[in-house]
């Protein structure tokens, strides 16, 4: 299931990097959450529970991210113009039932006043 | 199709070890939280163990804890209950089952371990 | 330790009529909306099958004739209908902490 471009500011600009942020709805207990650029993954975050209910969180791919109750963040540093792009959060919600998958997403602008080491 | 084929079971003495092993098939193994249920002749059913993803996380029953360790090899599709210091009340036919996500949704058929001497 | 018992023990029930298995919690299951509570039937020389979970959705495949309900501590499976092929022994589980504890199993037969 494809929802299109993010009905949210999905990027967040500062020192140089880019906050991207991907929402989940409250509902959701167990997901798998991609960061895609282009058709390429590059951050994955996976929130699993046990037979005990203990949580697990994994990341194949090493990103710097965040999570909370209802999205995950994912941070890019030391952006430059090869970053700009469409990028897109793929959840994939194992709980609650059924299985479901959600692509939303945007274009990421690069402008010179959010890049790291502007040359003067 | 999802498919658990449990091994290692038989007669062991008080004390002594034994490692089980269940081979799974069918589906990405990285992807679940396995886990060893087991059931004593003629009783119900008692949870014993579980391992996350990746090996990071584990849990056990109160009464193997100290004595039975739990492990996986996802590149082999691969759990494993290591059983040592084993008693009579641990004999039982023993289940590796896949946690899915919110019940068990896969068993194996089990593998029978008998202590006695 | 959350304490699972089911009740009855053992029931002889003619083909047709409903059955009724109860599970009690010692402390509730009810957690965000979701009661932690699954049932599973296992029959005579196989392992456990999973019937519901989170105490009223049925699995994919199993049969609309059973169906789970109740709330917090006390749950309930029905099977509107035995068909011989229910005899079995029919096991509550929770999964709201660790350790995740059974029921001690009910044991369906047809009378």
């Known amino acids: 299931e494809i929802n299109g471009s993010a009905n949210y500011e999905m990027f967040i600009f500062h020192n140089g990097g880019v906050q991207i942020l991907c929402k989940y709805p409250d509902i959701v207990q167990q997901f798998k959450m991609q960061l895609l650029k282009g058709g390429q993954i590059l951050c994955d975050l996976t929130k699993t529970k046990g037979s005990g209910n203990t949580v697990s969180i994994k990341s194949l791919k090493f990103c710097h991210s965040q999570l909370s109750n209802n999205s995950v963040s994912f941070f890019l540093y030391n952006l430059d113009h090869s970053h700009a792009n469409y990028y897109f959060c793929n959840l994939s919600i194992f709980d609650p039932p059924p299985f479901k998958v959600t692509l939303t997403g945007g274009y990421l602008h690069i402008y010179e006043s959010q890049l790291c080491c502007q040359l003067k | 199709e999802v498919q658990l084929v449990e091994s290692g079971g038989g007669l062991v003495q008080p004390g002594g070890s034994l490692r089980l092993s269940c081979a799974a098939s069918?589906?990405?193994?990285?992807?679940?939280?396995m886990d060893w249920v087991r059931q004593a002749p003629g009783k119900g059913l008692e949870w014993v163990s579980n391992i996350d993803h990746d090996g990071n996380i584990i849990n056990f029953a109160p009464s193997v804890k100290g004595r039975f360790t739990i492990s996986r090899d996802n590149a082999k599709n691969s759990l494993y209950l290591q059983m040592n210091s084993v008693r009579a009340e641990d004999t039982a036919v023993y289940y590796c089952a896949r946690w899915g996500h919110y019940a068990f949704d896969s068993w194996g058929q089990g593998t029978l371990v008998t202590v006695s001497s | 330790d959350i304490v699972m018992t089911q009740s009855p023990d053992s029931l002889a029930v003619s083909a047709g009529e409903r059955v009724t298995i109860n599970c009690k919690s010692s402390?509730?299951?009810?957690?965000?909306?979701?009661?932690?509570l699954i049932w599973y039937q296992q029959k005579p020389g196989q392992p456990p099958k999973l019937l519901i979970f989170y105490a009223s959705t049925r699995q994919t495949g199993v049969p609309d004739r059973f169906s789970g309900s109740g709330s917090g501590t006390d749950f309930t499976l029905t099977i509107s209908s035995l068909q011989a092929e229910d005899v079995a022994v029919y096991y509550c589980?929770?999964?709201?902490?660790?350790?995740?504890?059974f029921g001690q199993g009910t044991k369906l037969e047809i009378k």
């Open positions: 589980q929770h999964h709201y902490s660790s350790p995740p504890t």
């Open positions: 069918g589906f990405t193994f990285s992807d679940y939280w």
């Open positions: 402390q509730s299951l009810l957690s965000s909306g979701y009661n932690y």
